[in-house]
Interface confidence: medium
């Protein structure tokens, strides 16, 4: 089969060569070729060139359209991993480490606390918080995780909240909270996660993470 293909290729190449040679002879005005033949060959050649040029233009248009489409609606996604912090703040700390995602500069992790978006739109925002607590060692209040929003010029808002009672297991019982929802974000808006007791949060691989995805 390969040999037959090779012969076919060589035959086509030879035909192309003859065709090009004929055009050359037409251009130099060789008497052995009739005017009619030359006109036919020339128009055939022009047709080929036109086709090539049109294809090129179409490809260019398609590419530029793809680029425009890409520019207008780039993928925006982030997934960050929890980071233990010595600070007493109730806002959880995150890091671009391990198997994290930061699609481009249209979403950034600021101060290790908040995911900030540059484009307006609908975003699916989620957080998983795993914590280890004990009923006796903790206060009566449940462990609460909140997904919060800070828009420029606006005060912080709680978007989602979940509460879990403390475990009776000793020294502590692991529990996970998952928060997730779709929200309209303005350019410059930041989302962050707040918990009642950051010292109880589990920072082992895969336990606590936070992210968003532009829809």
């Amino acid at each position: 089969h390969r040999r037959l293909d090779k012969i076919e290729d060589e035959r086509n190449l030879h035909e192309d060569f003859v065709f090009m040679k004929t055009i050359q002879r037409c251009n130099t005005g060789e008497r052995s070729l009739s005017l009619l033949n030359c006109e036919e060959i020339k128009s055939q050649f022009e047709g080929f060139v036109k086709d090539i040029m049109l294809n090129k233009e179409e490809t260019k248009k398609e590419n530029s359209f793809e680029m425009q489409k890409g520019d207008q609606n780039p993928q925006i996604a982030a997934h960050v991993i929890s980071e233990a912090s010595s600070k007493t703040t109730s806002v959880l700390q995150w890091a671009e480490k391990g198997y994290y995602t930061m699609s481009n500069n249209l979403v950034t992790l600021e101060n290790g606390k908040q995911l900030t978006v540059k484009r307006q739109g609908l975003y699916y925002i989620y957080a998983q918080v795993t914590f280890c607590s004990n009923r006796e060692a903790s206060s009566q209040a449940p462990f609460i995780a909140s997904l919060c929003l800070k828009s420029p010029g606006r005060f912080e808002r709680i978007l989602l909240r979940a509460a879990n009672t403390h475990s009776s297991a000793k020294p502590c019982g692991q529990q996970s909270i998952h928060l997730g929802g779709v929200f309209e974000l303005q350019p410059g808006a930041s989302v962050f996660v707040n918990v009642t007791d950051p010292s109880q949060v589990s920072h082992g691989t895969g336990f606590t993470s936070f992210g968003l995805l532009k829809l």
């Epitope: 703040t89 800070k150 962050f192």
Partner: nanobody, 119 residues
Framework: EVQLLESGGGLVQPGGSLRLSCAAS????????MGWVRQAPGKGLEWVST????????YYADSVKGRFTISRDNSKNTLYLQMNSLRAEDTAVYYC????????????WGQGTLVTVSS
């Protein structure tokens, strides 16, 4: 009428500490981002720090990161700036500012309090 009154400035040696306070009145303090801005002698205004309305988010200029801590007490309508490891270049008039939004945008300023870091 919005009023911001700073206090706590003074003369301190390099490496020393100071705590500035800002008493706010005339607006719902707990609903606004607040911040500190400073002006060194013969220089322009420099943003120092901002804290969000509930106090959950804080922002700092690179020049003060790790040395200064901004905080607020919404029950007392008071803003604070704890300044540690002070340097000569921190010498400036420190202004308390109320923000309509954005961490470096403010619409009201106090009269300022002078902090001088010198041996």
């Amino acid at each position: 009428e919005v009023q911001l009154l700073e206090s706590g400035g003074g003369l301190v040696q390099p490496g020393g500490s100071l705590r500035l306070s800002c008493a706010a009145s005339g607006f719902t303090f707990s609903q606004y981002d607040m911040g500190w801005v400073r002006q060194a002698p013969g220089k322009g205004l420099e943003w120092v720090s901002t804290i969000s309305s509930r106090g959950w988010l804080t922002y700092y200029a690179d020049s003060v990161k790790g040395r200064f801590t901004i905080s607020r007490d919404n029950s007392k309508n008071t803003l604070y700036l704890q300044m540690n490891s002070l340097r000569a270049e921190d010498t400036a008039v420190y202004y308390c500012a109320k923000g309509p939004g954005g961490r470096r945008r403010f619409d009201y300023w106090g009269q300022g309090t002078l902090v001088t870091v010198s041996s």
